[in-house]
Every structure is written in C-alpha cells, then in structure tokens.
C-alpha cells in the first residue's frame, strides 16, 4: 500500500525531518507549514491547527519561505546620490546603487553603506585606473610627452601633438601649440596614431569601468566630499 500523505500539522517519524517548505515547531512538536515569500507567521501552529500566514505589512518583506513573526523592514529610501535598482516589495528588499560618478566607499553584507564621489584628476594628471562600482579613480602624473588639461574622473593623459614648428611647447597640463604648418601625432606605446591635420583632434576613447561583482548598495550615510588625493580635486 502507498504511504499516506501527511497533512500539516503532523508528528514526524522518529529520526526523520519535515518536508520541503515545512518546519519543526518545538512547542507543538509537529511539522508545520512555512509561509511563502511576502508573508510571515501571524499565528504559529499547534497540535491541531497549522501556521496562519499573513501578507507583509507596508515597507516590509520576506524573501524566503519562513515562519518569522514579523517581516523584515525594507532599507531606507535611496538618497539623492543613489539610484533605486530594485524596489521594496513584499518579497524583496530595496536595492540602491551609487549613481554615475559615484562609487561604493563602504560595503555592507548586502549593498552599500556609503557612496562617495569619484575622484577627479586635475590638469597635469590623468586616470591611471578608472573607478568601478566599489573603487575610486586612481590618478597619475602625466608622463613627459603627454598631457591632460581637464579636471575629470575619466580622462587619461594624451600624447602631445608633434609640430613641424613648435610655437609653444607642451607640458603635463597643456598640449603643444604648433605654428600654422600641419602637426603630426606622437606615437603612444602600443597604439598607432595617424598624422592629424591642425583643425582636428584625435578622438580618445574614455576608459570604461571594469565589471564588478560587488553587491549593490542599499544605504547612504551623509558624507562630505573626500579630501583630494595627490593629483585629484574635489567637486
């Protein structure tokens, strides 16, 4: 004869465990139903009655099958430095990520506790390592023959143009200025630069942030601008 299907609540066989989506209630000493995501246990089971579940109250959630007496509170609303990438619903917590131009300076178990603005490299300095979701921009001084004339969290040092006749020599923060004859471009290591006419600038692609598997941010604590590091500037 096939074994009878037990309906919750039921006493488990000695040494056996409760089935999937059930839990063992120590007080009732019975296997009882868990509540589905988006719900919580309003009334715990007894020997004769199963768990009574209820929907999560506004701004609370449960993500898993559970028997908690109260749903978890969603995180605070996203701050102005953040973007809500996942809304608070009965089944999931709110997720806030740092908005473009910011990175997560202080992570927590799930999400981010603190967003901070990406460092901007000042003229004479370029981006050595681009910012990611969880790391700041690293600036470096422009090497001889290169320059950056911007205050930017994305611009790298670019090679000076090479002039047939130099009007003003370039430096770390300024391109060379040629007289009216056509300039040529210097060769950057590992890259080919075709000669450019005076009237056009070469197009430089911006470094793109590396992909990051860091957890998304949830909270932002108030924070002023970070002190500028060498070669960087605040907003």
């Amino acid at each position: 004869l096939p074994a009878q299907v037990a309906f919750t609540p039921y006493a488990p066989e000695p040494g056996s465990t409760c089935r999937l989506r059930e839990y063992y209630d120590q007080t009732a000493q019975m296997c009882c139903s868990k509540c589905s995501p988006g719900q919580h246990a309003k009334v715990f089971c007894t020997k004769t009655s199963d768990t009574v579940c209820d929907s999560c109250e506004d701004s609370t959630y449960t993500q898993l099958w559970n028997w908690v007496p109260e749903c978890l509170s969603c995180g605070s609303r996203c701050s102005s430095d953040q973007v809500e990438t996942q809304a608070c619903t009965r089944e999931q917590n709110r997720i806030c990520t740092c908005r473009p131009g910011w990175y997560c300076a202080l992570s927590k178990q799930e999400g981010c506790r603190l967003c901070a603005p990406l460092r901007k490299c000042r003229p004479g300095f370029g981006v050595a390592r681009p910012g990611t979701e969880t790391s700041d921009v690293v600036c470096k001084p422009c090497a001889p023959g290169t320059f950056s004339n911007t205050t930017s969290s994305t611009d790298i040092c670019r090679p000076h143009q090479i002039c047939n006749v130099v009007a003003i020599p370039g430096n770390a923060s300024m391109d060379a200025v040629c007289t009216s004859t056509s300039p040529t471009r210097s060769m950057a290591p590992g890259a080919v630069h075709l000669p450019q006419p005076v009237s056009t600038r070469s197009q430089h692609t911006q470094p793109t942030p590396e992909p990051s598997t860091a957890p998304s941010t949830s909270f932002l604590l108030p924070m002023g601008p970070s002190p500028p590091a060498e070669g960087s500037t605040g907003d």
């Epitope: 929907s55 506004d58 701004s59 509170s73 969603c74 609303r77 809304a87 608070c88 009965r90 709110r94």
Partner: antibody, heavy 120, light 108 residues
C-alpha cells in the same frame, strides 16, 4: 502625471449614507495603498483607513471600523469611501491619498477633497 | 494608539526668522515612518518631509527635519512668505496611523 480626482460635494441628512469616489490616473495601482483622511472644519487631519487596491485588504482606525467601508474597483482605477449613519459631527472634507508600497506610508499625492455636509 | 503632540500649536514669526516645530510621540517611532505635511487654507495637504529628514522634489532646502525615537523637529532656516501654513507630523509606525494636531505658522 499622477492625479487623484474625487467626487463632488455632498449634502446629506442625519442617518443617511454617502459614497465618495477617488479616481486615480498616471500610475500603476498595483503597488500602492489608498488612504482616506478626514478634516472637520477648522480641525486637523484624522486618518480613517486604507485599502490595498490589488488585494482589497483594508485597515481602519478602530474609531471608524463600523462607520466607514473602503472598497476599490481596479478596472476603473477608483477607490471608494462609504460612510453610514451620518451625524452632524461627520461634516468634514474627506481626502484620498496614496502611499507607494515601500515608502513607509508617506502619502505623496492627495485628492482635492470632498466636502460632506450633514444637516437636517 | 501612538499620540503625536506638536508644539507650539501656533506661532507668529517674521520673514527671515528661524522657526522650529516639534513633534513628540507617545511611544517610539522608527525614523523611516515619520513624515511631515504642509497645508494651506482651502488646499489639500502636501508631503513636505518624508522619513524624518528627506525633502521631496520641489520643497525648498531651507526646510529640514531631524529627530529619532519620540522627538522630531521640522525647522525652517529662514521663513519666507510662502511658508505661512499649517504643518502636521504623521506616524506610520503602528496602526492606527496618526497625525499631530498641527502647528499653524502665521505672519507676525
């Protein structure tokens, strides 16, 4: 844009009932609550109850439990407040207001209000 | 029920004054669940500060909110003519959700 448009003013006799409507537009009714708040002449705001239009679940201030019936019809994006056994002290402006799920009850949009006058 | 008591009930102030309104809850309220509304005569209330200290778009930065537990404040750093109105605090921490009795800010 988000709008809550309420039905017009009502003049009722004591003992009668009134049904006030609140038509929502410009947003999805799914993840919001619709609240009803009343304001007697020259008085403050008094929360009466709220409804989850998606499920029909309601919550009341116990003071209004037997007096106010909240309902909604999602097909026409409208919430309703029905007040029974009207008395002179029920004379007030009745507001509907929405709060999005997850916003901790902050009522970010309000209807223009419906004046209900109870007088014999 | 959580009682919300505002003080003062009304105040007279001049343009440019710093104004502080307090709201005291009869039991602790999580800061996420404390909101303020502004209402002008003949108009519907407007959400003015949410979750204790956050300003919805369109609310001037001279307004600020703070507090925790049972004591919360709304501050106007420099009162402007358009700020004369009644302000209500509101708790959504525990049902039934309740409002303070209101604070009317009038022109001196």
């Amino acid at each position: 844009q988000v709008q809550l448009v309420q039905s017009g003013s009502e003049l009722k006799k004591p003992g009668a009932s009134v049904k006030v409507s609140c038509k929502a537009s410009g947003f999805n009714n799914k993840d919001i609550y619709m609240h009803w708040v009343r304001q007697a002449p020259g008085q403050g705001l008094e929360w009466m109850g709220r409804i989850d239009p998606a499920t029909g679940n309601t919550k009341h201030d116990p003071k209004f439990q037997d007096k106010a019936v909240l309902s909604s019809d999602t097909s026409v994006s409208t919430a309703y407040l029905q007040i029974s056994s009207l008395k002179a002290e029920d004379t007030a402006v009745y507001y509907c207001a929405r709060s999005p799920y997850g916003d901790f009850g902050a009522m970010d949009y309000w209807g223009q209000g419906t004046l209900v006058t109870v007088s014999s | 029920d959580i009682q919300m008591t505002q003080s003062p009930s009304s105040l007279s102030a001049s343009v440019g004054d710093r104004v502080t309104i307090t709201c005291t809850a009869s039991s602790s309220v999580s800061s996420n669940y404390l909101h303020w509304y502004q209402q002008k005569p003949g108009s519907s209330p407007k959400l003015w500060i949410y979750s204790t200290s956050n300003l919805p778009s369109g609310v001037p930065s001279r307004f600020s909110g703070s507090g925790s537990g049972t004591d919360f404040t709304l501050t106007i750093s420099s009162l402007q003519p358009e700020d004369f109105a009644t302000y209500y605090c509101h708790q959504y921490h525990r049902s039934p959700w309740t409002f303070g009795q209101g604070t009317k800010v009038e022109i001196k």
